[in-house]
Amino acid sequence: MMTGTIETTGNISAEKGGSIILQCHLSSTTAQVTQVNWEQQDQLLAICNADLGWHISPSFKDRVAPGPGLGLTLQSLTVNDTGEYFCIYHTYPDGTYTGRIFLEVLESSVAEHGARFQIP
């Protein structure tokens, strides 16, 4: 039985040109994590394999950095990065756990920004 749960950073609103960290944490299970995949829609961004380490997809190499931990750092954000990101934990013996994070990237001129983007 799959008893684990995935906690995420939560949805994130960020500014164009900035960087953010996507993180997931698997808890409430003793299952062994064999690999974590990071995906956006149907695109594979990166893989962290327990034995082989990190592999970043070639098309994202310039803007994606591994870590911290099993997380992923996205840099030089563009509005087109807006969308849903998935952390997919492959575990033994439980199977697959998936976490979801929605990233919204805003133009710096957008008025309806979160508090951390507002000019005092």
């Epitope: 939560g10 949805n11 807006t82 849903e84 979801r100 919204e104 805003l106 309806e112």
Partner: antibody, heavy 119, light 112 residues
């Protein structure tokens, strides 16, 4: 003035599909996400999912992943939701609602489209 | 999914009353950057829902200042300081911090 004009009420048979439209005006359609919300009779609101007109991305509530399909037509500033394999449980009012940038909320709502599934 | 519990289910009021509606979530609605995505809506009979409050406590354009939002973490409150006839309807909170977004069950504000 921001306006979201939805298509009219639908009476459909069980097993059939229906496509609801939501025509946006008064703002840049591609600059905002479009969300869809279900309200069953006398029940609370449920978020179905959203579509991102500027890059074609979608995000679904897994509960509706096999029930709803979200699309859009940039040229007419119209978002669509197709509801598949309808049952009586799908009888409800469906709203489109514009995403409120930076706050993971919605700011403007369509008038709602009533869908009744009955044989 | 995050469960959002709203209380009370029904709230009988008299015009001029001050009322509070509570919204509690099954996990924290503050993301790793310190932002909390909790909004409030009013659904009047025969109309579409309307946004009242976003980001816990920000009033949306045109919303009277008798409406105020507060809270943090998992506990949130909408206060209406002086009830007017146009305030009657169903109030719902929405969390947008975690996928999928989830609404509270609604609170019906009605005349005693």
């Amino acid at each position: 003035e921001v306006q979201l004009q939805q298509s009219g009420p639908e009476l459909v048979k069980p097993g059939a599909s229906v496509k609801i439209s939501c025509k946006a005006s008064g703002y840049s359609f591609t600059g905002y996400t479009m969300n869809w919300v279900k309200q069953s009779h006398g029940k609370n609101l449920e978020w179905i999912g959203l579509i991102i007109p500027y890059n074609g991305g979608t995000s679904y509530n897994q509960k509706f992943k096999d029930k709803a399909s979200l699309t859009f037509d940039k040229s007419s500033s119209t978002a669509y939701m197709e509801l598949l394999s309808l049952t009586s449980e799908d009888s409800a009012v469906y709203y489109c609602a514009r995403g409120f940038r930076g706050y993971f909320a919605v700011d403007y709502w369509g008038q709602g489209t009533s869908v009744t599934v009955s044989s | 999914d995050v469960v959002v519990t709203q209380t009370p289910l029904s709230l009988p009021v008299s015009f001029g009353d001050q009322v509070s509606i509570s919204c509690k979530s099954s996990q924290s609605l503050t993301n790793s950057y310190g932002d909390t995505y909790l909004s409030w809506y009013l659904h009047k009979p025969g109309q579409s829902p309307q946004l009242l409050i976003y980001g816990i406590s920000n009033r949306f354009s045109g919303v009277p200042d008798r409406f105020s939002g507060s809270g943090s973490g998992t506990n949130f409150t909408l206060k209406i300081s002086t009830i007017k006839p146009e305030d009657l309807g169903v109030y719902s909170c929405l969390q947008g911090t975690h996928q999928p977004w989830t609404f509270g069950g609604g609170t019906k504000l009605e005349i005693k």
